[in-house]
């Protein structure tokens, strides 16, 4: 539908078009499988318009249906390290808080490959914090064209 002139003059955030694209900052300390993200113009092609970062985890500020996407490339990678581990390397994206809404949204395994990528549409609510867990000991690349994570508000 076409926007009225008044709507055209509003910032995107007020129209509900929340969007974020993040790059990897660092991995967690021992016993913490989470990936920690960062975003902002000073860092390159990453940004937050609406959602915010809470200790490296992405927090949603507006209810709606979102497209969630992620790509992770391993900096330490071989066919044996990704396919024959006793504990295969997997990436999971989920709502980690609030605890009452905790759920897995995406789960991917590295099967004889060094890169995984996926996306899905899912409803998210204000206050939902998304966590990305990379199991195992393998180290992800911080190259911004290899590892990135984002959300895009699609509709209420």
């Amino acid at each position: 539908q076409r926007l009225s002139r008044a709507q055209q003059q509003l910032p995107l955030e007020s129209l509900g078009w929340d969007i974020a694209e993040l790059q990897l900052n660092h991995t967690g300390p021992q016993q913490d499988p989470r990936l920690y993200w960062q975003g902002g113009p000073a860092l390159g092609r990453s940004f937050l318009r609406g959602p915010e970062l809470d200790k490296g985890q992405l927090r949603i500020r507006r209810d709606g249906i979102y497209m969630v996407h992620i790509q992770v490339t391993l900096a330490i990678c071989s066919s044996t390290s990704t396919s024959r581990h006793h504990h295969p390397t997997t990436l999971a994206v989920g709502i980690c808080s609030p605890a009452s809404r905790s759920i897995s949204l995406l789960r991917l395994s590295f099967h004889q490959g060094c890169t995984i990528a996926s996306q899905r549409l899912t409803p998210l609510a204000r206050g939902d914090t998304l966590c990305t867990n990379l199991t195992g000991t393998l180290l992800p690349s911080r190259n911004t064209d290899e590892t990135f994570f984002g959300v895009q508000w699609v509709r209420p």
Partner: antibody, heavy 120, light 108 residues
Framework: EVQLLESGGGLVQPGGSLRLSCAAS????????MSWVRQAPGKCLEWVSL????????YYAESVKGRFTISRDNSKNTLYLQMNSLRAEDTAVYYC?????????????WGQGTLVTVSS | EIVLTQSPGTLSLSPGERATLSCRAS???????LAWYQQKPGQAPRLLIY???SRATGIPDRFSGSGSGTDFTLTINRLEPEDFAVYYC?????????FGCGTKVDIK
Amino acid sequence: EVQLLESGGGLVQPGGSLRLSCAASGFTFSTYAMSWVRQAPGKCLEWVSLISGSGGRTYYAESVKGRFTISRDNSKNTLYLQMNSLRAEDTAVYYCAKHDYSNYPYFDYWGQGTLVTVSS
Amino acid sequence: EIVLTQSPGTLSLSPGERATLSCRASQGVRSSYLAWYQQKPGQAPRLLIYGASSRATGIPDRFSGSGSGTDFTLTINRLEPEDFAVYYCQQYGSSPPTFGCGTKVDIK
């Protein structure tokens, strides 16, 4: 200026243990993955082990797995390599090396190395 | 693991000449993730090239890298006296990262 200074090498008997240290300065140590690389006298370079910037992820060459342990203390800007059950073939100069920001294991800065000799 | 074979083992040249060093991988190197290092006696290696062709900070432009897949080359144009050393290639696209055994560039 980035500086890496290894210490802790020496002569040890087969089956013995040694702990190497690498003191880092001139960069934000906790931001970067680090590795140990060794070079036996007159031989090729061999990557030994790596550790992520936070210390939560480690990886080892098959030749040392189960015998060596890599660790770091980011509050002291120091990298460690605990070497147990040492063998004659572990004799080498051991270098600590800083990864590029990307995490990939290529090394933009190296220490001067510390010599480990395993002999009876 | 990927085995890297460097040739020739020794290259005898005069200052001002061009050095061409070869590094061949036993299988394809992912995304041309290959580095070159220079090592002088009693010193640590120094990074020259990464990503097969990108020069590291502070490396003079007489050093250049090329290649992809399994065949890579380090070229040193107009050898300077300080360039006589051992050169190693290293792949870091597949674990474990592995090194070649070096090419020694010495003065003819």
